[in-house]
Amino acid sequence: IWELKKDVYVVELDWYPDAPGEMVVLTCDTPEEDGITWTLDQSGEVLGSGKTLTIQVKEFGDAGQYTCHKGGEALSHSLLLLHKKEDGIWSTDVLKDQKEPKNKTFLRCEAKNYSGRFTCWWLTTISTDLTFSVKSSRGSSNPQGVTCGAVTLSAERVRGDNKEYEYSVECQEDSACPAAEERLPIEVMVDAIHKLKYENYTSSFFIRDIIKPDPPKNLQLKPLKNSRQVEVSWEYPDTWSTPHSYFSLTFCIQVQGKSKREKKDRIFTDKTSATVICRKNASFSVQAQDRYYSSSWSEWASVPCS
Amino acid sequence: VPGGSSPAWAQCQQLSQKLCTLAWSAHPLVGHMDLREEGDEETTNDVPHIQCGDGCDPQGLRDNSQFCLQRIRQGLIFYEKLLGSDIFTGEPSLLPDSPVGQLHASLLGLSQLLQPEGHHWETQQIPSPSPSQPWQRLLLRFKILRSLQAFVAVAARVFAHGAATLSP
């Protein structure tokens, strides 16, 4: 058992049929010695008397808010939450496995540049009685500071009969060094509490591995005189790290015919312009990736050829 | 380069960009294969890293590129020795068309561009002996290549910036 916050405790339980559970001793926070009784949640049923109450916590029915009273007056409270461990693995019932980039991915994180700022998000089908807290650091044995903002409900989607909620948080490394080679990973820890169930989720990554640039901007087409060719140009996204001579991007460009089945010609270039044949009803697209490290490609930026 | 002369920025840029390509073809990203384990904070200390105070940022390069270039060269020699060690030459054997050989030669080539004959900078101690089990060796290869990818990315940025802004 450990204290999550004042008067709120997490009981770690091995979860299997007929498990013995954990013995927990609750102490009433009062100088009084006599006439103390204990109740659980809103039930008026007296569970025991005396300054301490010993309980065997085996299931969710044993968790909840315990109150000690004297003469009809509440003296102190303790809230017990459960953290389940099944077959040696902590439960992950609250958040949804996003399965990207691999199974058991509950937290996903992305960065638009090397500034030390990143966003993490997670999914759940649970709407009410759900709370989160987030902590982050660089490294774990001698952690360096990372400051996370508020968790916000960033999207709601209907998936069949279920509603899915996406929560996200933005964090910023306190002393980021964009040009250095990261030695220790960023750690992100999310505590999730649903009713009386406590769970924690972690993700560990280097910023370089979660980079996903914004799409190139100001995508423009300029027809060349007396030719079927057009000159296309684009710019680095505003959110990308500067100077661009140091933080360089590479680009993938393609012309896509009206039919999705039509063969797409893809060309890779480090330049911010190209000459292509752009037929009527086709569209031109460009995406960006860090030039020197194979992290994610940006989403496509597109313009119609006509 | 030693003694304050400028490197052949454009040549270094080309070779470092080639190194990036080779490092990724030697160990492509296998679904974000997570090679970090407990205690990794300690094992990552074995390899040289380009750190914040090494002057490899744009401002540091403008002020005095020598500190950064020396750091890069130390790293190149370190990785070149690793790729030539029995971690890579022992079992399991590399495939005949493995890019590791080219990567090894390119590391040597770039380190020589940064230090012509006759100059010797101190280099970092070569790493501890290779593990005995083939599977351990294979895992160590992956870790070394992942670490090398990060190192050469920073080096390539340095040379690209140098070629664009510091070339005579």
Partner: nanobody, 125 residues
Amino acid sequence: EVQLVESGGRLVQAGGSLRLSCAASGRTFDSNPMGWFRQAPGKKREFVAIISGNGGITNYANSVKGRFTISRDNAKNTIYLQMNSLKPEDTAVYYCAASGLYGSGSVYDLMYDYWGQGTQVTVSS
């Protein structure tokens, strides 16, 4: 210093309506769940209603569902409790609570970090 100040409580006839307000100062709670709890004489403090940071998710105690509505105005850093079809058993001191956590909030009062002084609601038959 964080302060939550409730207002709007008074004596009202059964079947009547009231609107409680809770204004927060000292910090913004626009991303945090806030809620209402109540305590009748000689009884435990009980959960009434909670609302998520953006106001999109609400949760009510069964005893008030369909009669009470919780809402918030983040620009004013204020939450409200519209109470309709009041019953004598709704008589209690109503407390506003704010959490330092995120999400849709908890029905347990110990999960809240900031509390108001309370406003008295008395429903006469």
